[in-house]
């Protein structure tokens, strides 16, 4: 049986935290790190659809970023494999109501953290 901390939501052996507050991309990742988590890594269409369903009407940062002229990478350093399109010309990715887009790192948005669930 999988379990997640209070205020976290479980889906397919992962736990997700949807923020109430807004922060820039860097501060959002710092928060996730403080919870032994990272900004969300989206590994399947099912996971993407789950996040889109649960995030509500606000944009939410996820754990994808890129250096200028470089490919998108997840927080753990693995390259993004183009599972879904990312619109926009920003360096950090977020989820909107239809999918993923990108914006400058200093803009403030809600965020989603993810980590492996706890098996009990």
């Amino acid at each position: 049986q999988a379990a997640c901390p209070e205020s976290w939501i479980g889906f397919q052996r992962k736990c997700f935290y949807f923020s109430d507050d807004t922060k820039n991309w860097t501060s959002s990742q710092r928060f996730c790190d403080s919870q032994d988590a990272d900004l969300a890594q989206v590994e399947s269409f099912q996971e993407l659809n789950f996040l889109l369903r649960y995030k509500g009407p606000s944009d939410h940062w996820i754990g994808l970023s890129r250096e200028q002229g470089q490919p998108w990478k997840w927080i753990n350093g693995t390259e993004w494999t183009r599972q879904f399109p990312i619109l926009g010309a920003g360096e950090c990715a977020y989820l909107n109501d239809k999918g993923a887009s990108s914006a400058r790192h200093y803009t403030e948005r809600k965020w989603i953290c993810s980590k492996s669930d706890i098996h009990v």
């Epitope: 807004t22 509500g56 009407p57 606000s58 944009d59 909107n96 914006a103």
Partner: antibody, heavy 121, light 107 residues
Framework: QVQLQQSGPGLVKPSQSLSLTCAIS??????????WNWIRQSPSRGLEWLGR?????????DYAVSVKSRITIKPDTSKNQFSLQLNSVTPEDTAVYYC???????????WGQGTMVTVSS | ETTLTQSPGTLSLSPGERATLSCRAS???????LAWYQQKPGQAPRLLIY???SRASGIPDRFNGSGSGTDFTLTINRLEPEDFAVYYC????????FGQGTRLEIK
């Protein structure tokens, strides 16, 4: 179709609290594909979003920075409605107040009839 | 907070003409979260366009939205007498903000 019916007083004294209610028919306040908002309109400030409540496995509230310290929006699942409370009002809070539905990614598609609220002694 | 600036403030045209209304955002807005509304005196705003370019239910096809990033446009082809009103743009991706409005009046 979805309809929103507003109720509440049209006159409030300065420093008191403004309270309005919005009754929902044709949808649920607990819907996981909608958010329920309060928006106001005045000649001086134009259309101004005040805040919203919505349910996604738990209840969330988002408030505009301009009113964050004195606003509360609450859902009432038993009556399928949501309410606005704005504390410490001043004449600058005089406006037409609207309750609205934001339907997932489809914009603010349903508006209440509007309530003209005057703040005056 | 994203600021939306609409231009022109007032647009004077005749029925049958084309109206082009502009909305510029202070920072990039997700195209999925940009809407246009029409408001007539004494009425609540009415949703015309959502997702920058999708027409709301019951909206005639002479109303068209376009744009992305920071620049968005509402075009009304073949103006009808009932189209003369005030038009607002709105972003709803990160809280919500409205433009100050464009008044479309009969020339």
């Amino acid at each position: 179709q979805v309809q929103l019916q507003q109720s509440g007083p049209g006159l409030v004294k300065p420093s008191q609290s403004l309270s309005l209610t919005c009754a929902i028919s044709g949808d649920s306040v607990s819907s996981n594909s909608a958010a329920w908002n309060w928006i106001r309109q005045s000649p001086s400030r134009g259309l101004e979003w005040l805040g919203r409540t919505y349910y996604r496995s738990k209840w969330y509230n988002d408030y505009a920075v301009s009113v964050k310290s004195r606003i509360t929006i609450k859902p009432d699942t038993s009556k399928n409605q949501f309410s606005l409370q704005l504390n410490s009002v001043t004449p600058e809070d005089t406006a037409v107040y609207y309750c609205t539905r934001l339907a997932n990614s489809d914009g603010v598609d349903v508006w209440g009839q509007g309530t003209m609220v005057t703040v005056s002694s | 907070e994203t600021t939306l600036t609409q231009s022109p403030g007032t647009l004077s045209l005749s029925p049958g003409e084309r109206a082009t209304l502009s909305c510029r955002a202070s920072q990039s807005v997700s195209s999925n979260s940009l809407a246009w509304y029409q408001q007539k005196p004494g009425q609540a705003p009415r949703l015309l366009i959502y997702g920058a370019s999708s027409r709301a239910s019951g909206i005639p096809d002479r109303f068209n939205g376009s744009g992305s990033g920071t620049d968005f446009t509402l075009t009304i082809n073949r103006l009808e007498p009932e189209d003369f009103a005030v038009y607002y743009c709105q972003q709803y991706g990160n809280s919500q903000t409205f433009g100050q409005g464009t008044r479309l009046e009969i020339k």
